[in-house]
C-alpha cells in the first residue's frame, strides 16, 4: 500500500496558491466526446494546474478544449499559478487569509467564514459549494485560529474544528484533531463524508480526519461536499499531507510525505452545480 510508503520531510513550503479559475469551463474534465476521430487537443487539468494534451473524438465534448497549448494557457492559467507561497507558521498569517471572499462557481449556497482583511476579523459569507479559495472555513473558530491575530501573533495551536452535522456522516460530529497533529490542508478535508441528495451508489473516497486515512463511502451522485474523491490516491494527495506533526524537541515541524516529491495539490474531483 503506497499509503504506508512514507518518509519524514521537513516542510519548507505549503500548498500551491488557491485555485481561482478565470472561466468555469476550465474546471470541466477532458471530454473526448462520442465520436471516433483522433484529434490532438488541449485541456486545463485542475489537479496539475496545467494545460495538457488529450485526444478528442471530433464531436460534442465541452468547452475545456483548445486547439493549441497557448490558447489553453491564455484562457485558463494565471501568471502566478505556479508560484509557491512561503509562510512562516509561527509569525505570519497564511497568505490565503488575505484573499477576498470567493463564492466559487457553484450554486449550492452555504454559510462559510473568511478572514476580512479590511475589518481584520473573520466574517460569514455566502459560498457556492465548490472551488473558490482557501480563505474559506467551516467554522468561525477555525477561521479565527488560522487568520485572526492572537495574543502572540499567528496561532498554530487549537486547529481542531467542530464538524457540521450532515446526513449520513461517517465521522463524528464533534471531533478534535489529536493535539500531536495540526491540520494545514484544505478545510474540507476535515468535513464529514456526505452522500448527497441523489439515489446513485458510486464508490468514492473521503478523508477521515479522526484516523488520518482515506476511506471509501457511497456517493449518491449529486450534492455532498468537497471531501469526495474518485480514487484513494487523489484523496491522499489532497488531504494526507495536510497533517503536520509537531516535534517538541527543537521545534521542527515535520510531516509524513510519500516518496514521490510532488507538491500538495488542491483536488476538486467533481464539481456539482446545483440549486438548493
Amino acid at each position: 500500500d503506497s499509503e504506508e510508503d512514507e518518509e519524514h520531510t521537513i516542510i519548507t513550503d505549503t500548498e500551491l496558491p488557491p485555485l481561482k479559475l478565470m472561466h468555469s469551463f476550465c474546471a470541466f474534465k477532458a471530454d473526448d466526446g462520442p465520436c471516433k476521430a483522433i484529434m490532438k487537443r488541449f485541456f486545463f487539468n485542475i489537479f496539475t494546474r496545467q494545460c495538457e494534451e488529450f485526444i478528442y473524438g471530433g464531436c460534442e465534448g465541452n468547452q475545456n478544449r483548445f486547439e493549441s497549448l497557448e490558447e489553453c494557457k491564455k484562457m485558463c492559467t494565471r501568471d502566478n499559478a505556479n508560484r509557491i507561497i512561503k509562510t512562516t507558521l509561527q509569525q505570519e498569517k497564511p497568505d490565503f487569509c488575505f484573499l477576498e471572499e470567493d463564492p466559487g462557481i457553484c450554486r449550492g449556497y452555504i454559510t462559510r467564514y473568511f478572514y476580512n482583511n479590511q475589518t481584520k476579523q473573520c466574517e460569514r459569507f455566502k459560498y457556492g459549494g465548490c472551488l473558490g479559495n482557501m480563505n474559506n472555513f467551516e467554522t468561525l473558530e477555525e477561521c479565527k485560529n488560522i487568520c485572526e491575530d492572537g495574543p502572540n501573533g499567528f496561532q498554530v495551536d487549537n486547529y481542531g474544528t467542530q464538524l457540521n452535522a450532515v446526513n449520513n456522516s461517517l465521522t463524528p460530529q464533534s471531533t478534535k484533531v489529536p493535539s500531536l497533529f495540526e491540520f494545514h490542508g484544505p478545510s474540507w478535508c476535515l468535513t464529514p463524508a456526505d452522500r448527497g441528495l441523489c439515489r446513485a451508489n458510486e464508490n468514492r473516497f473521503y478523508y477521515n480526519s479522526v484516523i488520518g486515512k482515506c476511506r471509501p463511502f457511497k456517493y449518491s451522485g449529486c450534492g455532498g461536499n468537497e471531501n469526495n474523491f474518485t480514487s484513494k490516491q487523489e484523496c491522499l494527495r489532497a488531504c494526507k499531507k495536510g497533517f503536520i506533526q509537531r516535534i517538541s524537541k527543537g521545534g521542527l515541524i515535520k510531516t509524513k510525505r510519500k516518496r514521490k516529491k510532488q507538491r500538495v495539490k488542491i483536488a476538486y474531483e467533481e464539481i456539482f452545480v446545483k440549486n438548493m
Epitope: Y109, Q118, E123, L140, N167
Partner: antibody, heavy 119, light 108 residues
Framework: EVQLVQSGAELKKPGASVKLSCKAS????????MHWVRQAPGQGLEWIGE????????NYNEKFKTRATLTADKSTSTAYMELSSLRSEDTAVYYC????????????WGQGTTVTVSS | EIVLTQSPATLSLSPGERATLSCSAS???????LYWYQQKPGQAPRLWIS???ILASGVPARFSGSGSGTKYTLTISSLEPEDFAVYFC?????????FGQGTKLEIK
C-alpha cells in the same frame, strides 16, 4: 440604545414599485448586516436578503433577486429596500433587522412597514 | 432551499403545563445555525434561542432547546401567561435563510 426606525405604511397598485427605509441608530451601522424580512398577513417569515453597508456586500434570496434592490446610505445610517413589479401577494409587513458579521442572530428589528398592494 | 416544517401549527395548553414545539428541516442543518424567534401580536419577532440551545438575553430558564440534523425542539417546562405567542424556527446554514411557518402557542 440600538434602534431601527422604518418608514410609514404604503398603498400601491399592482405593477408599481415601493422603496422602504430603515434608519439605524445607537450602533456602528457599517459593522453589521441589515436584513429584510417580510410577513404576509397570518403567515410566516420570509427572508428577502441582507446588505453589509461598509463594503456593499449583498446577498439576495433568489426568489426576490430580480425584483428587490437593497442599498444603504452610510452618511445617514439608513438601509433601503426597493421592490418592483408589485403584485397582490406582496402585501405584507416588511421588517428590517440587524445581525452581526459572524452569525444571523437578528437581535434588533424595526417596527415594520405595512405594504398593501391593491388595485 | 431548506424547508422548515413546524408542528403542531397550533398548540393549546394551560399555564403550568409543559410545551414541546418541533421544527423539522428538509435537509440536515448545523445545530449551530438553528435559531428560534418569538413573536407576539402586533410586534416584531424577538430572538429567543440561538445555536439550538443558547437562550437569548432575558429569556427565562424554563425555555430550552435541543436537536441536531433535521429534528429540533423548543421546550417550555412550565408555561407562564407571557409565553403564549408564535414561535418560529430559523436556519442560516444554507442560503436562502429560511423560517418555519410558526407554531402558535395559545391558552387553552
Amino acid at each position: 440604545e440600538v434602534q431601527l426606525v422604518q418608514s410609514g405604511a404604503e398603498l400601491k397598485k399592482p405593477g408599481a414599485s415601493v422603496k422602504l427605509s430603515c434608519k439605524a441608530s445607537g450602533y456602528t451601522f457599517t459593522s453589521y448586516w441589515m436584513h429584510w424580512v417580510r410577513q404576509a398577513p397570518g403567515q410566516g417569515l420570509e427572508w428577502i436578503g441582507e446588505i453589509k453597508p461598509d463594503q456593499g456586500r449583498i446577498n439576495y434570496n433568489e426568489k426576490f433577486k430580480t425584483r428587490a434592490t437593497l442599498t444603504a446610505d452610510k452618511s445617514t445610517s439608513t438601509a433601503y429596500m426597493e421592490l418592483s413589479s408589485l403584485r397582490s401577494e406582496d402585501t405584507a409587513v416588511y421588517y428590517c433587522a440587524r445581525s452581526s458579521v459572524v452569525d444571523v442572530a437578528m437581535d434588533y428589528w424595526g417596527q415594520g412597514t405595512t405594504v398593501t398592494v391593491s388595485s | 432551499e431548506i424547508v422548515l416544517t413546524q408542528s403542531p401549527a397550533t398548540l393549546s395548553l394551560s399555564p403550568g403545563e409543559r410545551a414541546t414545539l418541533s421544527c423539522s428541516a428538509s435537509s440536515s442543518v448545523s445545530s449551530s445555525y438553528l435559531y428560534w424567534y418569538q413573536q407576539k401580536p402586533g410586534q416584531a419577532p424577538r430572538l429567543w434561542i440561538s445555536g439550538t440551545s443558547i437562550l437569548a438575553s432575558g429569556v427565562p430558564a424554563r425555555f430550552s432547546g435541543s436537536g441536531s440534523g433535521t429534528k429540533y425542539t423548543l421546550t417550555i417546562s412550565s408555561l407562564e401567561p407571557e409565553d403564549f405567542a408564535v414561535y418560529f424556527c430559523h436556519q442560516w446554514s444554507f442560503y436562502p435563510f429560511t423560517f418555519g411557518q410558526g407554531t402558535k402557542l395559545e391558552i387553552k
